[in-house]
């Protein structure tokens, strides 16, 4: 025969009752036992598992004067705000000497109006763009049938006949409200009403129309905006270093963008006050009375180079016999691009102007032909970029060299085609 032959005489004289109710109900389960000697601690089980966090109270009443007399022990388990997780079989458990005893079971059940596990949420959608809404409810009692409503109008003839947990909306052209009703044998519960706000679609085809060193003209194609006309579009431009790398889908620029608003139509805007020869990223969003569209992806653009905005500075020209020494400094005004070099113009009183490309050097020694008797020599210098020459300096007359002045020794460049002077290589 199997091991274990002790007769189990249960100490329980009162077992937990049954509770059935709707969510949120508060109830108490009670069990009572009579034991001889020291009263044991009463534990509660739900579906055979000891409840670690039970809201229980235990009362002990002696039936005699002696500790070894009988005791009545009452344990009460309070269930506050009944939930589905509270349902199941409840028992009391005691360990007495070498015996484990459990009471007869009581049952906690849930029955009432449907309870929403998931309700439709407020959201924004682009005009004419498909989306899904979710709704989920449970009993008991089951089954629970759902009925979707759009702007308070049912989307099916009866509960359970239309879409259930997920409603697919192919697109909206106006802001609408959605809710769902949950029906079971106990009645109907209505979900929250979700507002679906229809925003303009993201603009398309953002592109450059024209470029100037300090301005860019851009255009785009607006997206659909439903029944709500666009009120304006917003363009953002942000400086982008070579290594910065705004990713195509990056939500925010790394620094404060330059923001401009455009009345629409036309869907075009001239962005000014930009830096020449500078990479930017631009994006656009359009707004209706319902709110803004999503931004387009960042589009990389670049302003072209401009010419230097000022002439070279501190030009000095000195003459010593048949040599002329000219030197200058880089313009203080913005170069608007990459400095490629300097041009020098030389002219005497009765001689034609001669142009020279000096390259990036900021000084030159000119070897004058003959005895250097050309009178009233003047020199002008201009800086240039790939976009062209900047403004020329005012003519600087050649001054006679005075003893004590430093005479720079420079590499000389010979240009045989010039009639008045040459650039001999030393």
């Amino acid at each position: 025969a199997p091991r274990g032959t002790q007769a189990e005489e249960s100490p329980f004289v009162g077992n937990p009752g049954n509770i059935t109710g709707a969510r949120g109900l508060t109830g108490t389960l009670r069990c009572q036992l009579q034991v001889q000697g020291e009263p044991p601690e009463v534990h509660w089980l739900r579906d055979g598992q000891i409840l670690e966090l039970a809201d229980s109270t235990q009362t002990q009443v002696p039936l005699g004067e002696d500790e070894q007399d009988d005791w009545i022990v009452v344990s009460q388990l309070r269930i506050t705000s009944l939930q589905l997780s509270d349902t199941g079989q409840y028992q009391c458990l005691v360990f007495l000497g070498h015996q484990t005893f459990v009471s007869q079971p009581g049952y906690v059940g849930l029955e009432g109006l449907p309870y929403f596990l998931e309700e439709p949420e407020d959201r924004t959608v682009a005009a004419n763009t498909p989306f899904n809404l979710s709704c989920q409810a449970q009993g008991p009692p089951e089954p629970v049938d759902l009925l979707w409503l759009q702007d308070a109008v049912p989307l099916a003839t009866a509960p359970g006949h239309g879409p259930q947990r997920s409603l697919h909306v192919p697109g909206l052209n106006k802001t609408s409200s959605f809710s769902c009703e949950a029906h079971n044998a106990k009645g109907v519960t209505t979900s929250r009403t979700a507002t679906i706000t229809v925003l303009p679609q993201q603009p398309r085809n953002l592109h450059l129309v024209s470029r100037q060193p300090t301005e860019l003209e851009v255009a785009w194609t607006p997206g659909l905006s439903g029944i709500y006309p666009l009120t304006h579009c917003t363009l953002q431009a942000v400086l982008s270093d070579d290594g910065m790398g705004i990713q195509a889908g990056e939500p925010d620029p790394p620094e404060e963008p330059l923001t401009s608003q455009a009345s629409v139509p036309p869907h075009q805007l001239r962005l000014g006050s930009l830096h020449p020869h500078t990479p930017y990223h631009i994006r656009v969003a359009c707004t209706s009375s319902q709110g803004p569209s999503s931004w387009t992806h960042w589009l990389p653009v670049e302003t072209p180079e401009g010419v230097p905005l000022g002439p070279p500075e501190n030009i000095s020209a000195t003459r010593n016999g048949s040599q002329a020494f000219v030197h200058w400094q880089e313009p203080r005004a913005p170069l608007q691009g990459t400095l490629l070099g300097y041009r020098l113009a030389y002219q005497g009183q009765d001689t034609p102007e001669v142009l020279m490309d000096i390259g990036l050097r900021q000084e030159v020694t000119l070897e004058l032909q003959g005895d250097g008797s050309v009178s009233n020599l003047t020199v002008c210098v201009a800086a240039y970029t790939a976009a062209g020459d900047g403004p020329w300096s005012l003519p600087v007359p050649l001054e006679a060299w005075r003893p004590g002045q430093a005479q720079p020794v420079h590499q000389l460049v010979k240009e045989p085609s010039t009639p008045a002077f040459s650039w001999p290589w030393w």
């Epitope: 274990g4 601690e41 484990t100």
Partner: antibody, heavy 118, light 112 residues
Framework: QVQLQQPGAELVKPGASVKLSCKAS????????INWVKQRPGQGLEWIGN????????NYNEKFKSKATLTVDKSSTTAYIQFSSLTSEDSAVYYC???????????WGQGTTLTVSS | DIVMSQSPSSLAVSAGEKVTMSCKSS????????????LAWYQQKPGQSPKLLIY???TRQSGVPDRFTGSGSGTDFTLTISSVQAEDLAVYYC????????FGGGTKLEIK
């Protein structure tokens, strides 16, 4: 008095299925978990899983999840373990035992010797 | 999953000698609600079902001789037989029931 009665032996062919029983008496069947334990010849004890008769809630040792299925029949106060696609590795003694929430006493059936052989 | 490790796997002693065997769990077996340690020791003699000796780590089952003592807390547990008798020839298993059940691999006790 508490008793767990198991048949002494079962002989089945490889690839077949078998359902072993454990008849409980002498206590409130729905109030205690029934555990199943495997012991291969000359080997140790391995817990297979358990079932709570009132709700038929089950827990399984991951190793036996695809091999064993636990059920109960409350009307006959009997617990069952069913094995599928039997192989020689399933040859063992299978015990049913009543859980006592870590306390005492605990009651074991005498075990069923399952032999899988062609 | 809780892992139970027993040592040694076997040992041989003479009648009258004291013997100890060890069981280690991979996590604590103390239940904060019931304040009990969910560790039991079983004795299994050849051809028999396992028999409960000790529960709650140190409580001797009714009818078990007092030469059997369980001790330990947290994760390290010991079964001691103070004076081994010939009828103690068996395999001894520890079992956790803190979270489902897991048995140790067993310690085989042989009498010289």
């Amino acid at each position: 008095q508490v008793q767990l009665q198991q048949p002494g032996a079962e002989l089945v062919k490889p690839g077949a299925s078998v359902k072993l029983s454990c008849k409980a008496s002498g206590y409130t069947f729905t109030s205690y978990w029934i555990n199943w334990v495997k012991q291969r010849p000359g080997q140790g004890l391995e817990w297979i899983g358990n079932i709570y008769p009132d709700s038929s809630s089950t827990n399984y040792n991951e190793k036996f999840k695809s091999k064993a299925t636990l059920t109960v029949d409350k009307s006959s106060t009997t617990a069952y373990i069913q094995f599928s696609s039997l192989t020689s590795e399933d040859s063992a003694v299978y015990y049913c035992t009543r859980d006592t929430y870590g306390g005492s006493p605990d009651y074991w059936g005498q075990g069923t010797t399952l032999t899988v052989s062609s | 999953d809780i892992v139970m490790s027993q040592s040694p796997s076997s040992l041989a002693v003479s009648a009258g000698e004291k013997v100890t065997m060890s069981c280690k769990s991979s996590q604590s077996l103390l239940n904060s609600r019931t304040r009990k340690i969910y560790l039991a020791w079983y004795q299994q003699k050849p051809g028999q079902s396992p028999k409960l000796l000790i529960y709650w780590a140190s409580t001797r089952q009714s009818g078990v001789p007092d030469r059997f003592t369980g001790s330990g807390s947290g994760t390290d547990f010991t079964l001691t037989i103070s004076s081994v008798q010939a009828e103690d020839l068996a395999v001894y298993y520890c079992k956790q029931s803190y979270n489902l059940w897991t048995f140790g691999g067993g310690t085989k006790l042989e009498i010289k």
